[in-house]
Interface confidence: medium
């Protein structure tokens, strides 16, 4: 009864502050929450990560842990503090009875508590054949010192550091935090214990079969000889990396997490903190032929999450399972029959498969890119990985139907050269989680902290939606989509771009009384239109006649249905220029597309008119896709007429800057 659709379980236990008469009672009305893995077999009851509020100091963490022990002892319970976290997340790891959870949730400073759970290596360990190392392929871009300025941390099993592929390239740290192996008949065998980590180290930086042959690596042991670890052990490993970074700042850091467990709020939070400290994290999407959003660290937005494809660009099937998919995957990479170092002997090679291998590929590519451009931020690196990927080569029929539109059709590739990408305006598409079906349900899509939201669209499989709008949240714009009565739910789709020194704002026009439709334009000097959104309160937008027409010579204008409010995203940035491109089809069609030409980047994608038979609009790479209801269910021809509206932008400033560098 594995709950494949199972949302992460959250048990909210109410605080009863009168008990124990706490000296530092929590703020009135706040509730600390308890979380645990949705997959029962992966749960580790009896060990809990107590996460404290963000500004909690180490001394307060220690005091809170001692208080828990004292109060537990008064009730006759033994507890053991296994670790006090600081540097990444404030909190502590405690071994205790689940009976004490209610007590622990009432302690001061407690934000939430998570039961520990298992994480697993994401390679398939069987049917491994002995094979010879691959021949050097001349057509591949392989600089001899690729990745030499970058340090890659590998959190995995132990490794065979004297293997010829990785000897002198991997430093084995003294970090080890692994659970006992399962089963009484288990015998540790060095070659088996080292198998997963050795192979991945070889894929990242191996002499013969490595992607980034110049990268140096450091290994931390968080997976045991059976490829199993814990969320808590992984957290302590990430904290170790952060402390190492603070003690001895080096060049760019890449952290490879070739493991997966159930959705974990605390593991995702730790990844977020490390990413915001400037570390690039790359993880396996998971091998469960499932939505990657149900797993961690794959579901952490700040992490680069990698699915696996084979040599034919098909998603990898692994026995009865296969690569994970969905909106939490950033891109795919080779992950089937990948040749790498075998721990059977110091010159042995072996083929392994899985999203671990795919993630190792991307970690190697990231190391190469960062070595060429050490100042790249995480957002810039992610955008470049997406930009240089092979587009639309994956056979999407392998994915469940409802996941196809959400799953990126991107296979990672090395850039043709490590320079010359600076002039490009980079954008990516970010899908929200599904809103759920309730009438007032909304879905929110967010960009990364150093990306600009240039447009916002929405999509509903049933077509019942009330559009979308850009709104400010915590000082940043977000994209919010609205479900309609009787709808099965909506997605919000954000177009997130790298636009240095940008100043963007949203201009709104309320529904027009006149029959000509609603219009809004960018009226500030120097501001250009990057995206149009429309939102309506009525349950069903009727047909809009006469059709909405954009007046000639007014490209900086959004137009829409007269019953909808229209929102224009207007940006000012050095050298930014944009143009509107439309593709209208008079007869009903399930899909209408319009693409930006070479040198221009799609920033906005919307549909005209916004009538109810339009399911929504979204960007796929540089193409704007507008989807409509099945033509057989659409009424008249005029009702079926749909126009896809793309806004294409480029930055002359970025182009100039890159030319000056050449």
């Amino acid at each position: 009864q594995e709950d494949e659709d199972g949302d992460y379980e959250e048990l909210v236990l109410a605080l009863r502050s009168e008990e124990d008469g706490l000296a530092e009672a929590p703020e009135h009305g706040t509730t600390a929450t308890f979380h645990r893995c949705a997959k029962d077999p992966w749960r580790l009851p009896g060990t809990y990560v107590v996460v404290l509020k963000e500004e909690t100091h180490l001394s307060q963490s220690e005091r809170t842990a001692r208080r828990l022990q004292a109060q537990a002892a008064r009730r006759g319970y033994l507890t053991k503090i296994l670790h006090v976290f600081h540097g990444l997340l404030p909190g502590f790891l405690v071994k205790m009875s689940g009976d004490l959870l209610e007590l622990a949730l009432k302690l001061p400073h407690v934000d939430y508590i998570e039961e520990d759970s298992s994480v697993f290596a994401q390679s398939i360990p069987w049917n491994l054949e002995r094979i010879t190392p691959p021949r050097y392929r001349a057509d591949e871009y392989q600089p001899p010192d690729g990745g030499s300025l970058v340090e890659v941390y590998l959190l995995d099993t132990s490794i065979q550091s004297d293997h010829r592929e990785i000897e002198g390239r991997v430093m084995v740290t003294d970090f080890e935090n692994v659970p006992e192996e399962d089963g009484t008949r288990f015998h540790r065998q060095a070659s088996k214990c080292d198998s997963h980590g050795t192979h991945l180290a070889g894929v990242v930086s191996g002499r013969d079969a490595g992607v980034a042959k110049g990268a140096s690596m450091r290994s931390l042991r968080v997976l045991n000889c059976q490829g199993k670890g814990t969320v808590s052990g992984t957290l302590i490993g990430l904290e170790f990396i952060r402390k190492s970074q603070l003690v001895q700042p080096v060049g760019p850091l890449v952290v490879l997490l070739p493991l997966a467990g159930g959705y974990s709020r605390v593991l995702n939070a730790a990844c977020q903190r490390l990413a915001r400290a400037g570390v690039v994290l790359v993880t396996a999407a998971g091998n469960f032929r499932d939505d990657a959003c149900l797993y961690s660290p794959a579901s952490a937005p700040e992490v680069i999450t990698v699915g696996a494809t084979n040599a034919q660009d098909q998603p990898v099937t692994l026995g009865t399972l296969g690569t994970n998919f969905g909106r939490c995957v950033d891109l795919f990479a080779p992950g089937e029959d990948i040749i790498g170092a075998s721990s059977d002997c110091s010159t042995c090679f072996v083929s392994q498969s899985g999203t671990s291998q795919a993630a190792a590929h991307v970690a190697g590519i990231a190391a190469m890119m960062l070595s060429a451009e050490p100042e790249l931020t995480l957002a810039e690196l992610r955008q470049r990985l997406i930009h240089f990927s092979a587009k639309d080569v994956i056979n999407e029929a392998w994915f469940p139907e409802d996941q196809r539109v959400l799953t990126p059709n991107l296979v990672a590739a090395l850039p043709p050269s490590t320079h010359g990408a600076g002039w490009q305006l980079f954008c990516r598409t970010v899908w929200s989680a599904h809103s759920g079906p309730t009438r007032m349900a909304t879905a929110v899509a967010r960009c990364a902290p150093d990306e600009e939201l240039l447009s916002c669209s929405s999509f509903s499989r049933s077509g019942k939606r009330r559009g979308e709008r850009m709104e400010a949240q915590g000082g940043k714009l977000v994209c919010r989509a609205h479900n309609a009565f009787g709808g099965e739910g909506v997605y919000a789709i954000a177009r997130c771009c790298l636009l240095p020194q940008a100043n963007c704002s949203v201009h709104t026009a309320p529904p027009a009384e006149a029959s000509m439709g609603t219009r809004v334009h960018c009226h500030q000097q120097g501001h250009v239109l990057t995206g149009c959104s429309s939102h309506w309160e009525v349950e069903d937008l009727g047909t809009h006649k006469p059709p909405v027409l954009r007046p000639r010579g007014q490209p900086n204008q959004c137009v829409g249905h007269r019953e909808a409010s229209i929102h224009a995203s207007c940006c000012h940035a050095p050298g930014l220029e944009c143009k509107v491109k439309e593709h209208g089809i008079p007869a009903p069609q399930e899909q209408v597309t319009v693409a930006c030409e070479e040198g221009w980047t799609l920033t906005g994608c919307s549909a005209l008119p916004g009538t109810s038979h339009v399911l929504g609009a979204y960007a796929v790479d540089n193409t704007c896709v507008v989807r409509s209801r099945d033509v057989s269910t659409t009424g008249s021809t005029s009702e079926g007429a749909v126009t896809a509206v793309a806004i294409c932008c480029r930055s002359r400033h970025l182009a100039q800057a890159s030319q000056e560098l050449q």
Epitope: Q1, E2, D3, E4, D5, G6, E9, D40, P41, W42, R43, P45, S118, V119, F120, A121, Q122, S123, I124, P125, G227, K228, A260, G261, N287, F288, R289, L318, G319, T320, L321
Partner: antibody, heavy 126, light 112 residues
Framework: QEQLVESGGGLVQPEGSLTLTCTAS?????????MCWVRQAPGKGLEWIGC???????TYYASWAKGRFTISKPSSTTVTLQMTRLTAADTATYFC???????????????????WGPGTLVTVSS | DIVMTQTPASVSEPVGGTVTINCQAS??????LSWYQQKPGQRPKLLIY???TLASGVPSRFKGSGSGTDFTLTISDLECADAATYYC??????????????FGGGTEVVVK
């Protein structure tokens, strides 16, 4: 030795109610198990009724069983099946089964009923 | 509702022969399929889990295969002791999907 024993079966009037109990020995319920009820009408096939998670007590039922059948876990070694508004079509041998998970790859697992009770016969008749 | 359909309802084969039983799910259940053997008046016994893995103590004459929607149980070198009714069962995501019955209708194997 691990075993399950069902009790509480017998003759019951139509529209009546009955509670069956499944008692485990040789093991106690942990979050690793689901305890399930399956029935078999005379001369017919097996019919899944539902399961309860021994970890958090969440219950799952066959679509036809929702509303009339309730599974609960009164202790760490007993599971009950409460049946209401019984009809002649509910006449069957009722089995209690333990669903445990089997791991077959890194983190991947499936469930199967590895331990069954001998069954208890419920006859609905006036 | 997920429905499990088992064919044939009955099959008769001589000792030493081979029997093939099919089980079809109305939608994909990955490899979440088990096979059980039940002799008259007895409780069911687990033979195979995960579509293809033999349960402890089950002879290798029993072989399970398939994934997704189509599954097969093959019994080779039939013995008299194999005379029983065989059931397939899926428990794929019961918490989030609706089942009429997790079991197939059963296949009676007669050994001549």
């Amino acid at each position: 030795q691990e075993q399950l024993v069902e009790s509480g079966g017998g003759l019951v009037q139509p529209e009546g109610s009955l509670t069956l109990t499944c008692t485990a020995s040789g093991f106690s319920f942990t979050s690793d198990y689901y305890m399930c009820w399956v029935r078999q009408a005379p001369g017919k096939g097996l019919e899944w009724i539902g399961c309860i998670s021994t970890g958090d007590g969440s219950t799952y039922y066959a679509s036809w069983a929702k509303g009339r059948f309730t599974i609960s876990k009164p202790s760490s070694t007993t599971v009950t099946l409460q049946m209401t508004r019984l009809t002649a079509a509910d006449t069957a041998t009722y089995f209690c089964a333990r669903d445990r998970y089997y791991s077959y790859a890194y983190g991947a697992y499936v469930y199967a009923s590895d331990l069954w009770g001998p069954g208890t016969l419920v006859t609905v008749s006036s | 509702d997920i429905v499990m359909t088992q064919t044939p309802a009955s099959v008769s084969e001589p000792v030493g022969g081979t029997v093939t039983i099919n089980c079809q799910a109305s939608e994909s259940i990955r490899n979440y399929l088990s096979w059980y053997q039940q002799k008259p008046g007895q409780r069911p016994k687990l033979l195979i889990y995960g579509a293809s893995t033999l349960a402890s103590g089950v002879p290798s004459r029993f072989k399970g295969s398939g994934s997704g929607t189509d599954f097969t149980l093959t019994i080779s070198d039939l013995e008299c002791a194999d005379a029983a009714t065989y059931y397939c069962q899926s428990n794929y995501g019961i918490s989030s999907r609706s089942y009429v019955n997790g079991f197939g209708g059963g296949t009676e194997v007669v050994v001549k």
